[in-house]
Interface confidence: medium
């Protein structure tokens, strides 16, 4: 019996589900909105997606690159086959997709892999189709694809009409942008005749140096500056002062960068790591670090047991006072994105913690029973329970609520994995702020 696909629908009427699927140039973009639920969902999904994509699998390599003969069949896990495979007619085997011909992006129970997209004439192939990822096509230089006409690439205009100036170049996603000289209002309609032609080089794909880009840049810089000043002035600063020696006074350190670097920190980085850890909500105790698989670099800092012990020194008071919030990097809708991530949580949260976690999140025993009965299979159970939680809690369901519940249960490793995945996938980023004021 099929209860759902891998990720079931979110709220009714919702249109796009932004899951870990093929990112082609033709997709629509969700509008900006950053509720806390988004943070939670995105975090979860991203976690898994980047874990999958961080490792170069045999299927991702072209046939001539493969080190050993490809295993064509394996057994399904919980009735699902991994990315790069589809399920056999009898449901007993997972069969590999054919490189360059078809693909599957996620755990699935499809009888056929999806056919690879062929780039149209007028498009360039940004990345080829592998068994786990569809072809990514992009308009050639000098042309663009609008959301209104996703089927074809259109030629960019060569210049702006009289009385207007060019503020945005031609990119594969947009025509040149023109604004009125005096008012600075954007021109969106078609240009009848180009008189005072301001030529644009059709090259420079995706050069985001438009007026809006500058405004956004300045705004972001201002916010960063305010946050930096706040950090430097806060009580936390007093604790950190002996170590910082000039990060806030122009020493140029970048704790975020160190935090997410893929190398093991050297001795000279330890002080900086300690500082960063004070600002972080999540620390991983020694014994859990040892259990963690020493993955290849995935954008997450690996600490030695000694170092991780050292990171635990800051008191709980500091932790509650300063908290680094996970916010979606793409400004998508939190609730929508959250739902899409649930499918991956089953792989990150130990099975015996599923029910305690859901109780902690506020589901009643009866609701948990109903969810278990509705679930299509074992792996589906956590997904179904989380959906119930979001339906019940609405906008109050957030990434942080979920992460805090895991922390309370002592599932710090699961919490860390989810956070790391969200960050390394690029879907989430840290926002510094007060724990109580910024949780929205």
């Amino acid at each position: 019996m099929e209860q759902r696909g891998q990720n079931a629908p979110a709220a009714s009427g919702a249109r796009k589900r932004h899951g870990p699927g093929p990112r082609e140039a033709r997709g629509a973009r969700p509008g900006p909105r950053v509720p806390k639920t988004l943070v939670l969902v995105v975090a979860a999904v991203l976690l898994l997606v980047s874990a999958e994509s961080a490792l170069i699998t045999q299927q991702d390599l072209a046939p001539q690159q493969r080190a050993a003969p490809q295993q064509k069949r394996s057994s399904p896990s919980e009735g699902l086959c991994p990315p790069g495979h589809h399920i056999s007619e009898d449901g007993r085997d997972c069969i590999s997709c054919k490189y360059g011909q078809d693909y599957s992006t996620h755990w699935n129970d499809l009888l056929f892999c999806l056919r690879c997209t062929r780039c149209d004439s007028g498009e360039v192939e940004l990345s080829p189709c592998t068994t786990t990822r569809n072809t990514v096509c992009q308009c050639e230089e000098g042309t663009f694809r609008e959301e209104d006409s996703p089927e074809m690439c259109r030629k960019c205009r060569t210049g702006c009409p009289r009385g207007m100036v060019k503020v945005g170049d031609c990119t594969p996603w947009s025509d040149i942008e023109c604004v009125h000289k005096e008012s600075g209002t954007k021109h969106s309609g078609e240009v009848p005749a180009v008189e005072e032609t301001v030529t644009s080089s059709p090259g420079t794909p995706a050069s985001p140096c438009s007026l809006s880009g500058i405004i956004i840049g300045v705004t972001v810089a201002a916010v960063v500056l305010i946050v930096a000043v706040f950090v430097c002035k806060s009580l936390l600063w007093k604790k950190v002062l002996p170590y910082l020696k000039g990060i806030c006074s122009g020493g140029g350190g970048d704790p975020e960068r160190v935090d997410r670097s893929s190398q093991r920190p050297g001795a000279e980085d330890n002080v900086l790591n300690e500082i960063v850890s004070i600002l972080q909500p999540t620390q991983v105790p020694e014994q859990e670090m040892e259990v963690q698989e020493p993955a290849e670099p995935t954008g997450v800092n690996m600490l030695s047991p000694g170092e991780s012990e050292h990171l635990l020194e800051p008191a709980e008071a500091e932790r509650s006072q300063r908290r680094r919030l996970l916010v979606p990097a793409n400004e998508g809708d939190p609730t929508e994105t959250l739902r899409q991530c649930f499918d991956d949580f089953a792989d990150l949260v130990p099975f015996d913690s599923w029910e305690p976690l859901m109780r902690k999140l506020g589901l009643m025993d009866n609701e948990i029973k109903v969810a278990k009965a509705e679930a299509a299979g074992h792996r589906d159970t956590l997904y179904t329970m989380l959906i119930k939680w979001v339906n019940k809690t609405g906008r109050d369901a957030s990434v942080h609520t979920l992460l805090d519940a895991l922390e309370t249960l002592g599932e710090r490793l699961a919490k860390q994995k989810i956070e790391d995945h969200l960050l390394s996938s690029g879907k989430f980023m840290y926002l510094e702020g007060n724990a109580d004021s910024a949780m929205s």
Epitope: N7, G19, A28, F112, L114, R115
Partner: nanobody
Framework: EVQLVESGGGLVQPGGSLRLSCAAS????????IGWVRRAPGKGEELVAR????????RYADSVKGRFTISADTSKNTAYLQMNSLRAEDTAVYYC?????????WGQGTLVTVSS
Amino acid sequence: EVQLVESGGGLVQPGGSLRLSCAASGFNIKDTYIGWVRRAPGKGEELVARIYPTNGYTRYADSVKGRFTISADTSKNTAYLQMNSLRAEDTAVYYCARYWSYFDYWGQGTLVTVSS
């Protein structure tokens, strides 16, 4: 812009029939699976049927096997769900969705009410 628009829902008596349509735009249905998912009041989502228009492969939930038929007309870029022998428990909002091993785009849904 990718869009899925459902139509054909309504009120029907038990044992009656309805045909739902799902008009897709912004992508070619031949390139994906198309599924019909329903959400009944107080129940979870159920994937009732899906089709891979490229080769006509279909699959159904046990609860609708033999009663529902999913089909697609690739020339019209439209998928259909023919629902026969309808029961009260088929009452739900039916969504058409694009399926890439998980559903990424959804329609707004069409309400099907089976009641005497």
